[in-house]
Interface confidence: low
């Protein structure tokens, strides 16, 4: 279920799957929610630790049991991912942090009159992930009212420093507030060039596009279909970026599909989940559990309820069925995508709906057990 | 909202505008989306106008002037007014609206979390009231959704300011001693929300107050935590299962 409580002065021991710098616990929790394996997180505010390297540290954690031992650490904040929390799942983060400088690659500097205007500029710049703004009272006069637009390889700051009269924040593109607008078109038989930032396996171009939309550095993508001539590249989704923000070239190519991230769409973003079920397809991955259920929809529900499950395969092979129930294979991987996709099988596959924000399974408060 | 500022897109995605279409169409009250098919508002919004088919509920909007005849709206399937609400009193000023069709959630249209039943221990320090209501006592409905940060006031303090009315434990008050910031006419039914541990909760429903933003006259709100049993009972009996974001 959905667990929203935060634990003050507590730090989860072990289970680390990733670490980064974030300005507060809520942003750390959001990164945990969107990380394919993160179930728990711990955050170290600047006040909680003397080690400059660990200040603002956000530690994403996984656990087979869904929990980890808590150790007392003054000032630390820990909590759960919001993976099963329905409408609370959002990559939108509006807060502005005063007295904090979020470091990254500064690619644009301009003079603006307010931090809100700086945030707007970041939101309206295709490459900007976060920003810092030097206020009117900044100690160096020549930097006052400077708006620095930034990006980093992981989409989070490479460091966070306490600095007076500086305010920082994130792009509001995930809030669907970008003025850039987006290309909804999918281009059949076209491959984009430029830099690959990641490679995942997906069953179709639409899943590829959604993954691109929620990847911090993906601006466009190319997907190789299951009939692509090179077998090892079938169902490969290449997430791409470029200096200009658009593909520098595109090549006509049979059995490829290309398109753009939808992060810059106005008013609507795709949900960060994939609800379609793929008949005759087997998703490979690490086995989490196998259970007998009645129907592929129940299999998907079972996967959704098991928080670590990322995708599933429902087998219809006679040896995998007992009366009306068949085997539901609950699976996971390092990146949340299948490690292999096989066609022509007797069964169906799909993804967990744990990141769908329309779920009614969500609650907003701490779970309390009845006596 | 008196003393407020413009909101931005998606800042308060649970805020809805309750409008009546008679000869003309106008905004009457606010409300809060609490589930795909449920809106929580003030009972007094329906005083004299309990006809379901004249109401139009607009969600996912920021600017009332953007509403055209083509703007999608929700219609009411059922109005559930608290059984103990009386027109002449301030008590039990709470109502549920069941929409005819469920709404999809987006960044601009999603529900607000409800508090735990009888939530008395949480100390809320970051509370906001939102609405399209008057910006001064004899003002007019605002186009852009307004927001204002207002501190909660203890019921004892509130009772001192309203000696002619009973401030019950099922009410919550908010305001500045010096006035200047408050809800006003047309904000009724809208949310008083507080952020706690990074999460917004619906603490109150805008109900009443002496004038607007007057010195030592806080706004009075229906305390949602006190009505959690009622909300759950009504939404579950109507649906078979709870359709709003509430404690497990």
């Amino acid at each position: 279920g959905c667990l929203t409580q935060l634990y003050e002065n507590a730090f989860f021991r072990g289970g680390d799957v990733a670490s980064m710098y974030t300005p507060n616990a809520q942003y750390c929790q959001m990164r945990c929610t969107f990380h394919p394996r993160c179930l728990l997180f711990s955050f170290l505010p600047a006040s909680s630790i003397n080690d400059m390297e660990k200040r603002f540290g956000c530690f994403l954690k996984d656990s087979v049991t869904g929990t980890l031992p808590k150790v007392h650490r003054t000032g630390a904040v820990s909590g759960h991912s919001l993976k099963q929390c329905g409408h609370q799942i959002s990559a939108c983060h509006r807060d502005i942090y005063k007295g904090v400088d979020m470091r990254g690659v500064n690619f644009n500097v301009s003079k603006v009159s307010s931090v809100e205007e700086c945030q707007k500029r970041c939101t309206s710049n295709i490459r900007c992930q976060f920003f810092s703004y030097a206020t009117q009272t900044f100690h160096k006069a020549e930097y006052r009212n400077n708006c620095l637009l930034k990006y980093s390889p992981g989409g989070t700051p490479t460091a966070i420093k306490v600095l007076s009269n500086v305010e920082s924040g994130f792009s509001l593109k995930p809030c669907a507030l970008s003025e850039i607008g987006c290309h909804m078109n999918i281009f059949q038989h076209l491959a984009f060039s430029d830099v690959d930032v990641a490679r995942v396996l997906t069953p179709d171009a639409f899943v590829c596009r959604t993954i691109c939309t929620y990847h911090p550095n993906c601006l466009f993508f190319t997907f190789y279909t299951n009939v692509w001539k090179i077998e090892s590249q079938r169902n490969v989704c290449l997430l791409k970026t470029s200096e200009s923000g658009t593909p520098s070239s595109s090549t006509p190519q049979e059995n490829t599909i290309s398109g753009y991230s939808l992060l810059t769409c106005k008013r609507t973003l795709p949900e960060p989940c994939h609800s379609k079920i793929y008949p005759g397809v087997d998703f490979g991955g690490e086995e989490l559990n196998v259970t007998f259920v009645k129907g592929v929809n129940v299999c998907q529900e079972t996967c959704t309820k098991m928080i670590r499950c990322q995708f599933f395969t429902y087998s219809l092979l006679p040896e995998d069925c007992k009366e009306e129930k068949c085997k539901c294979f609950l699976r996971l991987s390092m990146d949340g995508s299948p490690t292999r996709i096989a066609y022509g099988t007797q069964g169906s596959s799909g993804y967990s709906l744990r990141l769908c924000n329309t779920g009614d399974n969500s609650v907003c408060t701490t779970k309390t057990s009845t006596r | 909202i008196v003393g407020g500022t413009n909101s931005s897109w998606g800042e308060w995605p649970w805020q809805v505008s309750l409008q009546v279409k008679l000869t003309a169409q106008r905004h009457l009250c606010g409300g809060s989306l609490i589930g795909h098919q449920w809106v929580l508002t003030a009972a007094h919004c329906f005083d004299g106008l309990p006809l379901q088919d004249v109401w139009r509920i607009y969600s996912g909007i920021l600017n009332l002037s953007d509403i055209t005849k083509d703007t999608p709206f929700s219609q009411i399937k059922e109005i559930i007014i608290h059984q103990n609400y009386k027109v002449s009193e301030g008590n039990h000023d709470i109502a549920l609206i069941k929409l005819q069709a469920p709404l999809n959630y987006t960044e601009f249209q999603k529900p607000i979390c409800l508090p735990s039943k009888g939530d008395t221990s949480t100390i809320y320090t970051n509370c906001w009231v939102t609405g399209w209501g008057f910006s001064k006592e004899k003002g007019e409905i605002q186009n852009i959704l307004q927001k204002v940060n207002i501190p909660l006031v203890t019921n004892e303090e509130c009772q001192k300011r309203y000696q002619d009315y009973k401030i019950t434990q099922r009410m919550v008050c908010a305001g500045y001693k010096e006035g200047g910031k408050d809800a006003c006419k047309g904000d009724s039914g809208g949310p008083l929300v507080c952020k706690h541990n990074g999460m917004w909760r619906l603490v109150g429903i805008t109900s009443w107050g002496e004038g607007c933003a007057r010195r030592e006259q806080p706004g009075v709100y229906t305390k949602v935590a006190e009505y959690m049993d009622w909300i759950l009972e009504k939404t579950q009996s109507s649906d078979g299962k709870a359709q709003m974001q509430s404690p497990a």
Partner: antibody, heavy 122, light 106 residues
Framework: EVQLLESGGGLVQPGGSLRLSCAAS????????MMWVRQAPGKGLEWVSG????????VYADSVKGRFTISRDNSKNTLYLQMNSLRAEDTAVYYC???????????????WGQGTMVTVSS | DIQMTQSPSTLSASVGDRVTITCRAS??????LAWYQQKPGKAPNLLIY???TLESGVPSRFSGSGSGTEFTLTISSLQPDDFATYYC????????FGQGTKVEIK
């Protein structure tokens, strides 16, 4: 802008009838207690009749009970006063007004129209 | 029915004077009392409600006090614009007006 506009006044003979209207605009008419108040030439204000928001409850001053009927059409934002068996002492400027009830709601305040003159004379 | 008795019925005063008008209810009306100002040929204008709460936009020289059966309207320093007739009104049980107090130039 909030407005109340009375109409229907005029000269009528004793025993005659008249129907006053009050057109409301700029506020949520259906939410308010509406009332009629009159003022005889050179005299004070006298409350005549009131009607609650839904129209289900109507109240009258003793001086007009049984002769006057107050009603409202919320769909037309209009208040009415049907005056039958008129007497010379009913001669007055008739104002429509609305005012708060119970707790001061976030949508209640006090407004008067400019009045319409009714003269009952043979 | 609740009767409202206002006194005096006429009051002569000069600009700058402090003026007090009283209103007595035939039974307790708590604080459910309003004061209105009316100028010839015009509709009444609300000054004070709930006995002592100043209506928005009304000058602070006007104040109200009292509860139960005895109420007072005070104008701390009479201005030329204040020469008019003043009415009290109870709204505890339906509505009743006092007979009015005319404030005229001395």
């Amino acid at each position: 802008e909030v407005q109340l506009l009375e109409s229907g006044g005029g000269l009528v003979q004793p025993g005659g009838s008249l129907r006053l209207s009050c057109a409301a605009s700029g506020f949520t008419f259906s939410h308010y207690i509406m009332m009629w108040v009159r003022q005889a030439p050179g005299k004070g204000l006298e409350w005549v009749s009131g009607i609650y928001s839904s129209g289900g409850i109507t109240v009258y001053a003793d001086s007009v009970k049984g002769r006057f009927t107050i009603s409202r059409d919320n769909s037309k934002n209009t208040l009415y006063l049907q005056m039958n068996s008129l007497r010379a002492e009913d001669t007055a400027v008739y104002y429509c007004a609305y005012r708060r009830i119970g707790v001061p709601r976030r949508d209640s305040f006090d407004i008067w129209g400019q009045g319409t003159m009714v003269t009952v004379s043979s | 029915d609740i009767q409202m008795t206002q006194s005096p019925s006429t009051l002569s005063a000069s600009v700058g004077d402090r003026v007090t008008i009283t209103c007595r209810a035939s039974q307790s009306i708590s604080s459910w009392l309003a004061w209105y100002q009316q100028k010839p040929g015009k509709a009444p204008n609300l000054l004070i409600y709930k006995a002592s709460t100043l209506e928005s936009g009304v000058p602070s020289r006007f104040s109200g006090s009292g509860s139960g059966t005895e109420f007072t309207l005070t104008i701390s320093s009479l201005q030329p614009d204040d020469f008019a007739t003043y009415y009290c009104q109870q709204y505890n049980t339906y509505w009743t007006f006092g007979q009015g107090t005319k404030v005229e130039i001395k």
